[in-house]
Interface confidence: low
């Protein structure tokens, strides 16, 4: 007998063809011999089956000897053998209805697990293969699990259910909730305004949550909360902000924080934690602030950086258009008795300048000027 696979919630059309290309009497029955539908002349008649309100046919095709059974809003329990009786013949069609659902919300936090559950009719033994948006294949039976979801897992998952050498395809849209970047570093000269941005890697119609920026200043013995906030329908409202520093926060997404001045006492690293309503767990983004200061005190020209710098970063002091006078993998460098001119303090990584501060050294009878 013919096998047809259907998807839960979809519509299926089971075909039945007579040799005569004209409208003749036909009946569709289920395996219990209960009439589903048929015709009386040009009228569609329905039997007492459970499919009553979901079963239909195409009258326009009857004159061509085609008597389809259309079942709308398919349910797993519609899986059955359907018999078309026409011209003293019986055509049997086995319908197998499958459903595939994500057993949790389809919006999942980065690092969480996705479980896809297959609903299948009794007696069936389907195999399932799913392909993630990044091309990763997973196979399984009634359930498929993917642990430690990554940002690249966001998108449409295509799952193929195979049964009796027939297949049916499901598409499930998965949104992995995460920040675009796990970590970021901001390099600033002392006194400059600092902008921290925390863009999300997803868009949803309605976004609700709350969050906090917890900060560990390099020069402080303990970490503290710099700001707490609510996120309601993509609108940000500040709950509490520490008095020093006096952070400001943008009212719209992406989450945006402004520190009026970069000061050595603020240099360090922070963790922005965002709790999304109805989600177990939180989103995190690490943010680091590196602050540079160049000063001349009496006969000593000093350049310092504060904050989380990697050991491979190079700190240099050089007179403009000349070779570096001093260059070290340290957080402070100095030159004694610097000659007059424009000095540059450079923080660089493999030759790439990350941060630069200029200081003008005047002849010894005057005081230094910082541009």
């Amino acid at each position: 007998k013919k096998v047809v696979l259907g998807k839960k919630g979809d519509t299926v059309e089971l075909t039945c063809t007579a040799s005569q290309k004209k409208s003749i009497q036909f009946h569709w029955k289920n395996s219990n011999q209960i009439k589903i539908l048929g015709n009386q002349g040009s009228f569609l008649t329905k039997g007492p089956s459970k499919l009553n309100d979901r079963a239909d046919s195409r009258r326009s095709l009857w004159d061509q000897g085609n008597f389809p059974l259309i079942i709308k809003n398919l349910k797993i329990e519609d899986s059955d053998t359907y018999i078309c009786e026409v011209e003293d013949q019986k055509e049997e069609v086995q319908l197998l209805v499958f459903g595939l659902t994500a057993n949790s919300d389809t919006h999942l936090l980065q690092g969480q697990s996705l479980t896809l559950t297959l609903e299948s009719p009794p007696g069936s033994s389907p195999s399932v293969q799913c392909r993630s948006p990044r091309g990763k294949n997973i196979q399984g039976g009634k359930t498929l699990s993917v642990s430690q979801l990554e940002l690249q897992d966001s998108g449409t998952w295509t799952c193929t259910v195979l049964q009796n050498q027939k297949k049916v395809e499901f598409k499930i849209d998965i949104v992995v909730l995460a920040f675009q970047k796990a970590s970021s570093i901001v390099y600033k000269k002392e006194g400059e305004q600092v902008e921290f941005s925390f863009p999300l890697a997803f868009t949803v119609e309605k976004l609700t949550g709350s969050g906090e920026l917890w900060w560990q200043a390099e020069r402080a013995s303990s970490s503290k909360s710099w700001i707490t906030f609510d996120l309601k329908n993509k609108e940000v409202s500040v709950k509490r902000v520490t008095q020093d520093p006096k952070l400001q926060m943008g009212k719209k997404l992406p989450l945006h924080l402004t520190l009026p001045q970069a000061l050595p006492q603020y240099a360090g690293s922070g963790n922005l934690t965002l709790a999304l309503e109805a989600k177990t767990g939180k989103l995190h983004q690490e943010v680091n602030l590196v602050v540079m200061r160049a000063t001349q005190l009496q006969k000593n020209l000093t350049c310092e950086v504060w904050g989380p710098t990697s050991p491979k970063l190079m700190l240099s002091l050089k007179l403009e258009n000349k070779e570096a006078k001093v260059s070290k993998r340290e957080k402070a460098v100095w030159v004694l008795n610097p000659e007059a001119g424009m000095w540059q303090c450079l923080l660089s990584d493999s030759g790439q300048v990350l941060l630069e501060s200029n200081i003008k050294v005047l002849p010894t009878w005057s005081t230094p000027v910082q541009p």
């Epitope: 949790s104 919300d105 309605k206 976004l207 309503e277 109805a278």
Partner: antibody, heavy 119, light 107 residues
């Protein structure tokens, strides 16, 4: 100020048809999903149908599928519910509601319009 | 369809009382739950969304909690204007469904 005003209710015989309208003001209508919710006399609330911002997606409760049609005209800031093959059990106050609340909540509701199906 | 069952169906209380209304979903709905207040002859009014978040303008004596299948709405200090019917509603999957309602009456 957000406002939703329903109209079109009335007395209709079983098997008859009615078309309910809901005119929205005070917000960008085309940016929101919209719903119809009904309440039979002395009973609880029953969600009937909803439609996406542009009307491309529509969902219905099983009891009205095939009989009721939800549609919208964003140019007229209007939501409609075409009700055919009406039954006595469809008698209810019909509310138009905006799905503008977070977590898909219905944040604004109209005052309702009464539909009575009786012979 | 997901069934939403509210308990109790009615509660008699006095002004100043603490009232808790429960709502149970027949299957997990995460935090896709809203609470509405309805007064006779009026449209429902949104109180709580996302199971626990207070809608703007709603007094802080109202609070919601829960996750998955079991939820509750609490009115810490009942006020005269709180005597009404309260409905929970799931928005996890279509068709959206409401509880049968809980009437808070004056004792």
């Amino acid at each position: 100020e957000v406002q939703l005003v329903e109209s079109g209710g009335g007395l209709v015989q079983p098997g008859g048809s009615l078309r309910l309208s809901c005119v929205a003001s005070g917000f960008t209508f085309s940016s929101y999903w919209m719903s119809w919710v009904r309440q039979a006399p002395g009973k609880g609330l029953e969600w009937v149908a909803n439609t996406k911002e542009d009307g491309s997606d529509k969902y219905y409760v099983d009891s009205v599928k095939g009989r009721f049609t939800i549609c919208r005209d964003n140019a007229k800031n209007s939501l409609y519910l075409q009700m055919n093959s009406l039954r006595a059990e469809d008698t209810a106050v019909y509310y138009c509601a905006r799905e503008g609340g977070q977590w898909l909540a219905l944040d604004y509701w109209g005052q309702g319009t009464l539909v009575t199906v009786s012979s | 369809d997901i069934q939403m069952t509210q308990s109790p169906s009615s509660v008699s209380a006095s002004v100043g009382d603490r009232v808790t209304i429960n709502c149970r979903a027949s299957q997990g709905i995460s935090s896709w739950l809203a609470w509405y207040q309805q007064k006779p002859g009026k449209a429902p009014n949104l109180l709580i969304f996302g199971a626990s978040s207070l809608q703007s303008g709603v007094p802080s004596r109202f609070s919601g909690s829960g996750f998955g299948t079991d939820f509750s709405l609490t009115i810490t200090t009942l006020q005269p204007e709180d005597f009404a019917t309260y409905h929970c509603q799931q928005a996890n999957s279509f068709p959206w469904t409401f509880g049968q309602g809980t009437k808070v009456e004056i004792k």
